[in-house]
Interface confidence: low
């Protein structure tokens, strides 16, 4: 007869791991026992447990409570074990001896192969800002026996740079992911994936980029100069602009205080029916915590007795 | 840096024994943490692993050649040995001995020979 | 035994250009699968473990994938070194078995 056996088993850490010995013995032959024994380099023989075939499963202390037999029915020339709930240190060689009649004993070795499945963890880095150079957007680390893939999935145009760690039983990676910040790539996901042959599927953390920015500011509402004429109801600027955080408008006028009857909301400034004390400069300021804009209006408020309509200045400054 | 070095002779008759050694330089076979592997190419075709041995001596083979091949180990030279027994012309191959890592990765060969080549003829 | 089957036999490429190499297996080998790569009168050399990983020393112009029975080798921008035989090797299950090669040539 020979021993039936695998070279190596696989196990993820935390689930059982079946150490297979099968004896495929000739007609008539008997197993009276197997012993299996853990069998690494440089250490002595660690029993594991003994199966008999008559006395059943006996289990040494030191493995009381996580070895079994697999469930029925079994087969008498099967001397196949459980191990419960594999961990790292469980990794190595083992061994299972047959004793077998008529024929003598047998032996044969396995290597048992945990795998440590990664717990990936993303960091973002340091706050985004348009017009910085190459920046780190996010690192990724994931540490797992063997060594984890780690990559990145986005739309971000970005380099990637990598480096491992090996420790005793396991091995740490870490990618970062650095790019050029621009105003486009807010609210993107970036994605970091975990690929490892303990998984079932890859792992994903996404982070959103955030990317501070401010746009130049501008100012509508001159488009038509002739509509700015006395006693028009309803005239109102609008300032432009859009930033990350979201900016706050400040309005005022060059020339002297904003006149009465003249409200501001936010973004707009509303007038009442015009007159010409409206006419003058205006000031939109705008602003976040990462820069401030400013556009100025020339406002000319027409007498329609008057023959000729007055110019309309537009600038912008920043 | 880990080497091998295969050695042996290159033409074995028909029905005899092949038997070949692998030294290794530049490292211990015993410390452990490393099997060690035969694999064969016949000219022209693809490989073919024929066994790996730990330097305990536990050893495992390939089916198809189990029945002829014994590898054993001498850690005192630093070698691995290969025999393959009632030889015929189909076993006319490079032979490559090869490092196996284990349990670190790489778990693949990560190491090999140069080779040698062995053929079978009378 | 895992039978591992290697696409196309032979793949002509020009140099600069990129290389896709298939290599299934018959049973899931979970990611216990590697590549090498192999000149004329040179032993293999190990390129890629664990399906997707680079072995030390290997240009990041390679780049493995796939788990389970589907897996591919890419080489992105060939360089004239790169012609040679690969093969795809399954170490999940006893026997080890290797692919019957793939030649890339130049085209």
């Known amino acids: 007869g020979e021993l039936e056996t695998s070279d190596v088993v696989t196990v993820v850490l935390g689930q059982d791991a079946k150490l297979p010995c099968f004896y495929r013995g000739d007609s008539g032959e008997q197993v009276g026992q197997v012993a299996w024994a853990r069998v690494d380099a440089g250490e002595g023989a660690q029993e594991l447990a003994l199966l008999h075939s008559k006395y059943g499963l006996h289990v040494s202390p030191a493995y009381e409570g996580r070895v079994e037999q697999p469930p029925p029915p079994r087969n008498p020339l099967d001397g196949s074990v459980l191990l419960r709930n594999a961990v790292q240190a469980d990794e190595g060689e083992y061994e299972c001896r047959v004793s077998t009649f008529p024929a003598g004993s047998f032996q044969a070795r396995l290597r048992l192969r945990v795998l440590v499945p990664p717990l990936p963890s993303l960091n973002p880095g340091p706050a985004l800002e348009e017009g910085q150079g190459l920046t780190l957007a996010a690192s990724c680390t994931a540490e797992g026996s063997p060594a984890p893939s780690v990559t990145w999935d986005t739309e971000v145009k970005g380099t990637t740079s990598s480096r491992s760690f090996k420790h005793s039983r396991s091995a740490a990676v870490t990618s970062e992911f650095h790019l050029v910040p621009s105003r486009s790539m807010n609210g993107q996901p970036l994605t970091c994936v975990v690929s490892h042959p303990g998984l079932l599927q890859d792992q994903r953390i996404t982070h959103i980029l955030h990317v501070s920015f401010l746009a130049e500011a501008s100012v509508r509402g001159l488009e038509d100069q002739n509509l700015w004429h006395i006693g028009r109801e309803g005239a109102m600027l609008k300032c432009l602009s859009e930033g990350q955080p979201p900016p706050s408008y400040n309005w005022t006028r060059l020339d002297g205080p904003l006149p009465s009857g003249v409200r501001v909301d936010g973004d707009t400034l509303g007038f009442p029916p015009l007159t010409t004390e409206h006419s003058g400069i205006y000031v939109c300021h705008v602003s976040n915590e990462f820069s401030s804009r400013d556009s100025q209006v020339t406002v000319d408020v027409l007498d329609p007795q008057e023959d000729s309509g007055k110019q309309v200045d537009l600038v912008s400054a920043s | 840096q880990v080497q091998l070095q295969e050695s042996g002779p290159g033409l074995v008759k028909p029905s005899g024994t092949l038997s070949l050694t692998c030294t290794v330089s530049?490292?211990?076979?015993?410390?452990?943490?490393?099997?060690w592997a035969w694999i064969r190419q016949p000219p022209g075709k693809g490989l073919e692993w024929i066994g790996s041995?730990?330097?305990?001596?536990?050893?495992y083979y390939n089916p198809s050649l189990k029945s002829r091949v014994t590898i054993y180990v001498d850690t005192s030279k630093n070698q691995f040995s290969l025999k393959l027994s009632s030889v015929t012309a189909a076993d006319t191959a490079v032979y490559y001995c090869?490092?196996?890592?284990?349990?670190?990765?790489?778990?693949?060969?990560?190491?090999w020979g140069q080779g040698t080549m062995v053929t079978v003829s009378s | 035994e895992i039978v591992l089957t290697q696409s196309p036999a032979t793949l002509s490429v020009s140099p600069g250009e990129r290389a896709t190499l298939s290599c299934r297996a018959s049973?899931?080998?979970?990611?216990?699968l590697a590549w090498y790569q192999q000149k004329p009168g040179q032993a293999p050399r190990l390129l890629i473990y664990?399906?997707?990983s680079r072995a030390t020393g290997i240009p990041d112009r390679f780049s493995g994938s796939g788990s389970g029975t589907d897996f591919t080798l890419t080489i992105s921008r060939l360089e004239p070194e790169d012609f040679a035989v690969y093969y795809c090797?399954?170490?999940?299950?006893?026997?080890?078995?290797f692919g019957g090669g793939t030649k890339l040539e130049i085209k």
């Open positions: 090797h399954q170490y999940g299950s006893s026997p080890l078995t």
């Open positions: 049973q899931s080998v979970s990611s216990n």
């Open positions: 090869a490092r196996d890592p284990f349990p670190e990765p790489p778990d693949a060969f990560d190491i």
């Open positions: 664990g399906a997707s």
């Open positions: 041995i730990y330097y305990t001596g536990s050893t």
């Open positions: 530049g490292g211990s076979i015993s410390s452990g943490g490393y099997y």
